[in-house]
């Protein structure tokens, strides 16, 4: 750092004063010197270091008419909004010829009410769940003693006796306010007041009670909600995707969930209008007057298979001599599961019904024994899934095929490996 030389008398006739104040104060330090000849530039030092970006103004007043006469030079350093970084020893410095002169020092100090570096923040917490709040204040002057308050009531018997920077709250059962007082020799500063909103705890043990092809009954255990009764619970169901998304841990499903509200108690809900034999993910959150709990994790569930809701369509049954040709199309109504096959039943007047499992084929050729004279022969077809048979079609009479009519293509297809069915009473 530059040092003054004592070979010549110091040109300074006025030295910087002292400033002590609170944060944000604006003040000015002033230096005055008298020199002969061209006035020098006045530099400012803080703690021995030149201030490169000082907010200083320099005024020069000639004492004579000649340039070589004496000049009065005044330099003023403005400190705006005093901060801790502004504190220290201030001096003026000038270079005159080959010599350096430094003024007597002035001091800038910061002293005021405590200043908060950190204040408690608003937040939501689940009922009876521990959490921490932070508060940090500084002087000068130090020390700064903190006193936490909950709902305006001190949490310790005196400042500095309780928790200081971090307050650990073991749990709340009602929405509360927290603030922090900072005490030092100059006075007291109070932090902002943080509102801690108590929400219900996340529900637990979400599980299936019963399953139907298009509806699921689910139940859960509510979490604690403090002094605030639960008003309702909300259940969301979403179609499970292809293994990404929910299963990969994403918080929200890609498509819009199906949302249902349940009055509570009971903590149970029947979810309807679902697709049969379909994987879903479900979750639940419960709400009090203070707001909703967090959602449970997504629970994978699946609706069971149902039976087909309608019979096979467009059943056609014709007879040509000792052969009967029957064909049909898949039911238009929802299958409610994986189609496993078809059952066919035929019956003549005053004869027992014969039941056949056709498998997944949609046509069958029956070999009729005898002269096929049984009258009023009718055929019914039903589709089935693992859950059981769907509704049977209305009986279709077996019509004789008349030459000249186009024979359907499917009637040319025989069953080579299937043994012919016979009517034992023919």
């Amino acid at each position: 750092a530059p040092r003054g030389t004592q070979a010549e008398e110091s040109p300074f006739v006025g030295n910087p004063g002292n400033i002590t104040g609170a944060r944000g104060l604006t003040g000015t330090l002033r230096c005055q010197l008298q020199v002969q000849g061209e006035p020098p530039e006045v530099h400012w030092l803080r703690d021995g270091q030149i201030l490169e970006l000082a907010d200083s103004t320099q005024t020069q007043v000639p004492l004579g008419e000649d340039e070589q006469d004496d000049w009065i030079v005044v330099s003023q350093l403005r400190i705006t909004s005093l901060q801790l970084s502004d504190t220290g020893q201030y001096q003026c410095l000038v270079f005159l010829g080959h010599q350096t002169f430094v003024s007597q020092p002035g001091y800038v100090g910061l002293e005021g009410l405590p200043y908060f570096l950190e204040e408690p923040e608003d937040r939501t917490v689940a009922a009876n769940t521990p959490f921490n709040l932070s508060c940090q204040a500084q002087g000068p002057p130090e020390p700064v003693d903190l006193l936490w308050l909950q709902d305006a009531v001190p949490l310790a018997t005196a400042p500095g006796h309780g928790p200081q920077r971090s307050l650990h709250v073991p749990g709340l059962n009602k929405t509360s306010s927290f603030s922090c007082e900072a005490h030092n020799a100059k006075g007291v500063t109070t932090s902002r007041t943080a509102t801690i909103t108590v929400l219900p705890q996340q529900p637990r043990n979400l599980h299936l009670v019963s399953r139907q092809p298009t509806e699921l009954e689910v139940a859960w255990t509510p979490g604690l909600s403090g002094i605030y009764p639960l008003t309702h619970c909300t259940l969301q169901a979403v179609l499970s995707d292809d293994g990404m998304g929910i299963q990969a841990g994403e918080p929200d499903p890609p498509e819009e969930p199906l949302t249902s509200q349940a009055s509570v108690p009971p903590h149970q809900l029947r979810l309807g209008s679902l697709h049969p034999h379909t994987p879903y993910h479900i979750r639940v959150a419960c709400t009090s007057s203070q707001g909703p709990s967090s959602w449970t994790h997504w629970l994978p569930v699946e609706t069971p298979e149902g039976v087909p809701l309608g019979p096979p369509e467009n059943i056609s049954a014709t007879r040509n001599g000792s052969q009967a040709f029957v064909h049909w199309q898949e039911p238009r109504a929802p299958l409610q599961g994986t189609l496993l096959g078809y059952r066919l039943a035929y019956q003549g007047q005053d004869t027992p019904e014969v039941l056949m499992d056709i498998g997944l084929r949609q046509e069958v050729t029956l070999e009729l024994q005898g002269d096929g004279s049984v009258s009023n022969l009718t055929v019914c077809v039903a589709a089935y899934t693992a859950a059981g048979d769907g509704p049977w079609s209305l009986p279709v009479p077996l019509e004789a095929w008349r030459p000249g009519e186009a024979q359907p293509v499917h009637q040319l297809v025989k069953e080579p490996s299937t043994p012919a069915f016979s009517w034992p009473w023919w």
Epitope: P143, D145, A156, T157, A158, P159, G160, H161, G162, Q164, H183, N184, A185, K186, G187, V188
Partner: antibody, heavy 113, light 107 residues
Framework: QVQLQESGPGLVKPSETLSLTCTVS????????WGWIRQPPGKGLEWIGY???????SYNPSLKSRVSISRDTSKNQFSLKLSSVTAADTAVYYC???????WGQGTLVTVSS | DIQMTQSPSSLSASVGDRVTITCRAS??????LRWFQQKPGKAPKLLIS???NLAAGVPSRFSGSGSGSDFTLTISSLQPEDFATYYC?????????FGQGTKVEIK
């Protein structure tokens, strides 16, 4: 520099009221809490009570019916009054900030006729 | 009231010794405990606050430990200026109560 100084009579007659004042310099009594502690000769320390920066008070229940702590913010002083004193109240009385960073040097009050 | 029991009531030790003083509260006081040193004719001096926090300007040979109802003040290497009486104070509840003191004397 923070300093606390107790002042008041060193001798009080039985049944009279003991009055002490603590003058604080370098620290505003409108911040923090300010207390009185006493120590009978050759014995341990006993907490008497305190006054808060806002002027509310807390007293040791064993003395509560006889004790009063007040303040004068314009003089940056707080005071102790203990009524109906007996020889058992003979002690060195200390004033202190309740964080106990700063204490007065103590003043001996003797209760005797 | 919360009772504070200090032990021992006095002890003799030599310079360089490790000295331990204990303080037991009659109920849980968390860490609302302070330790003081008092020399004859002087006001007590704060050593430890919050059961474990060394006060400004106190040598690091002093340390505090404990929480709940059992607390310890340890002087790791006793120095000549440490011969004094030591007190604990609970400030968890009003009335604040001091231990009866432990006098550390020269052996």
């Amino acid at each position: 520099q923070v300093q606390l100084q107790e002042s008041g009579p060193g001798l009080v007659k039985p049944s009279e009221t003991l009055s002490l004042t603590c003058t604080v310099s370098g620290y505003s009594i409108t911040s923090n809490y300010w207390g009185w502690i006493r120590q009978p000769p050759g014995k341990g320390l006993e907490w008497i009570g305190y006054i808060t920066y806002s002027g509310s008070t807390s007293y040791n229940p064993s003395l509560k019916s006889r004790v009063s702590i007040s303040r004068d913010t314009s003089k940056n002083q707080f005071s102790l009054k203990l009524s109906s004193v007996t020889a058992a109240d003979t002690a060195v009385y200390y004033c202190a900030i309740t964080t106990f960073y700063y204490w007065g040097q103590g003043t001996l009050v003797t209760v005797s006729s | 009231d919360i009772q504070m029991t200090q032990s021992p009531s006095s002890l003799s030790a030599s310079v360089g010794d490790r000295v331990t003083i204990t303080c037991r509260a009659s109920q849980d006081i968390g860490n609302y405990l302070r330790w003081f040193q008092q020399k004859p004719g002087k006001a007590p001096k704060l050593l430890i606050s919050g059961a474990t926090n060394l006060a400004a300007g106190v040598p690091s040979r002093f340390s505090g430990s404990g929480s709940g109802s059992d607390f310890t003040l340890t002087i790791s290497s006793l120095q000549p200026e440490d011969f004094a009486t030591y007190y604990c104070l609970q400030s968890k509840e009003s009335p604040w109560t001091f231990g009866q003191g432990t006098k550390v004397e020269i052996k």
